[in-house]
Interface confidence: medium
């Protein structure tokens, strides 16, 4: 969690001098409770903003915005911490409002946004506005939160922000899968224009479970550059067991924007459904999928006794 | 050249646990699953299950479900099998092996004596 | 679970001899069988794969045949090396199995 590399954050407005401070999230009202206190934000609003940075680099930003309620309490209020919370890392980052000037009745109600809050694709949030002093112990809340989802790099305005691109969001590998003879399945990928390896993994499972029966991976090494948009074919020697015929077939790109990290796509072979009447054909009703990015780095188990190896398609 | 070595001989207490360590060497581990046999004295082979390096899997015996736990640490090329609640027919030599459907390298075995 | 049973349990054969044990399936495993070779205070040592495909490093004395639910494990000309235990072992499902042994023994 970050901010956006911006100019200088602003949170004033007519009738309100305003600065925005880092914040630790623990305000001071916390350990030193005051007697008057504000009420919570209202309409809380989050919403998917798209910034660039002083470099021009696009970044997805949660778009924050709220309202104040129209009581006396206003009069009490000091500013507001903003705290984000990345709900799969405990991860939090916080900024403070802080009042300069006292608030005074107007005719608008009063509004407040924030706009520099960097998310990454995919994640999930969860955005708090307290108004500040927070309260006394045992006093009414007045904060208030909502969960914000950020889309994948599949999303089309996703897709081109800086994180998703140097993902590898633009790569469309067109995974095709066809089953063989001798218990193999060849895939067959394109290339991007990149000369970096990539992983293609081989998950089975039972038809009538979601049991892992077997797992292979191949190592695809760097193509040449006249290799380039080519197309890639492995051939997977398939477990023995026939009932382990749902097939769950990952590549990964190690591009060195994103090394063990970058976007992997995905396919599905169903089991096939046999009939008195027909033979098995080469599957062809795979089902696309968009894998999330993989925190981890590590590349495991290959079982791929006479499997053969890839070669490019020209 | 492939080396599975496991850790050495234990001798435990019933209700107690034991974990058995089996560090591979001489081949990328994270391209072979790891499977678990034992052997009680005189007796013969038993599978005991098998851990996908790859995806983190597994596959378990059926009669120790619930007293098995196999696991992976890429970073040392090292598998572990932790079995709980032993009891005095645990008694055997345990032993890893590379591969998930046949095995082709055995560790050296691990004897572990469930007494009281 | 898939039974195997293999026949005899011990077998007496003399150097230079050949030695022929059996390995039955309860049910069709087709040809995914391995045969283990082990020596006592040993791992088992891998022979066969695939019902009768050689591992690394095997003498050609040692052949597999058989699919379906019915394999055999010949030693043509025992050595006195061979002297062991044999296993048979299916992985067409699981669990995978093993045969309860035999015992090849210097008659």
């Known amino acids: 969690l970050r901010l956006l590399d911006h100019r200088a954050l602003v949170c004033s407005q007519p009738g309100l001098n305003c600065t925005v401070k880092n914040s630790t999230c623990l305000d001071d009202s916390w350990i030193h409770p005051r007697n008057l206190t504000p009420s919570s934000p209202k309409d809380l609003q989050i919403q998917l903003h798209f910034a660039h940075t002083q470099q021009g680099d696009l970044f997805p930003v949660a778009h924050i915005e709220w309202t104040l309620q129209t009581d006396a309490s206003i009069l009490y209020l000091e500013g507001a911490e903003l705290s984000v919370l990345q709900l799969n890392t405990n991860e939090r980052l916080c900024v403070k409002f802080q009042f300069l000037s006292m608030l005074q009745h107007h005719r608008k109600r009063w509004r407040f946004s924030f706009s520099h809050f960097v998310v990454d694709p995919g994640q999930e949030y969860e955005v708090t506005v307290h108004h500040l002093p927070k309260p006394i112990p045992d006093g009414d809340p007045n904060h208030q939160s909502k969960n914000f989802l950020v889309p994948d790099c599949e999303h089309a305005r996703m897709k081109v922000t800086t994180p998703c691109m140097s993902s590898g969001s633009l790569w469309d590998p067109n995974i095709t899968v066809e089953t063989l003879e001798a218990h193999q399945l060849r895939v067959s990928f394109t290339l991007w224009n990149e000369s970096t390896p990539y992983q293609v993994l081989l998950e089975s499972f039972s038809d009538s479970e979601n049991h892992s029966c077997f797992d292979v991976v191949k190592q695809i090494f760097a193509p040449r550059q006249e290799e380039f948009h080519q197309r890639a074919n492995v051939t997977f020697t398939l477990s023995k067991f026939h009932w382990c015929c749902h097939h769950h077939v990952q590549v990964q790109p190690f591009f060195s924007s994103c090394l063990n990290d970058c976007l992997r796509h995905a396919v599905t072979v169903p089991c096939p459904v046999i009939s008195n009447t027909t033979v098995p054909k080469p599957v062809a009703d795979y089902i696309p999928l968009w894998e999330p990015r993989s925190g981890s780095s590590d590349y495991k188990d290959d079982d791929d006794k006479g499997s053969s190896h890839h070669h490019h398609h020209h | 050249q492939v080396q599975l070595v496991q850790s050495g001989a234990e001798v435990k207490k019933p209700g107690a646990s034991v974990k058995v360590s089996c560090k591979a060497s001489g081949y990328t581990f994270t391209r072979y699953g790891i499977s678990w046999v034992r052997q009680a004295p005189g007796q013969g082979l038993e599978w005991m299950g098998w851990i996908s390096t790859y995806s983190g899997n597994t596959n378990y015996a059926q009669k120790l479900q619930g007293r098995v736990t196999m696991t992976t640490d890429t970073s040392t090329s090292t598998a572990y099998m932790e079995l709980r609640s032993l009891r005095s027919d645990d008694t055997a030599v345990y032993y890893c092996a590379r591969r998930q459907l046949y095995f082709d390298y055995w560790g050296q075995g691990t004897l572990v004596t469930v007494s009281s | 679970e898939i039974v195997m049973t293999q026949s005899p349990a011990t077998l007496s054969v003399s150097p230079g001899e050949r030695a022929t044990l059996s390995c039955r399936a309860s049910q069709s495993v087709s040809s995914n069988l391995a045969w283990f070779q082990q020596k006592p205070g040993q791992a088992p040592r891998p022979l066969i794969y695939d019902a009768s495909t050689r591992a690394t490093g095997v003498p050609a004395r040692f052949s597999g045949s058989g699919s379906g639910t019915d394999f055999t494990l010949t030693i043509s000309s025992l050595q006195s090396e061979d002297f062991a235990v044999y296993y048979c072992?299916?992985?067409?499902?699981?669990?995978?199995?093993f045969g309860g042994g035999t015992k090849v023994e210097i008659k």
């Open positions: 072992q299916q992985y067409d499902n699981w669990p995978l199995t």
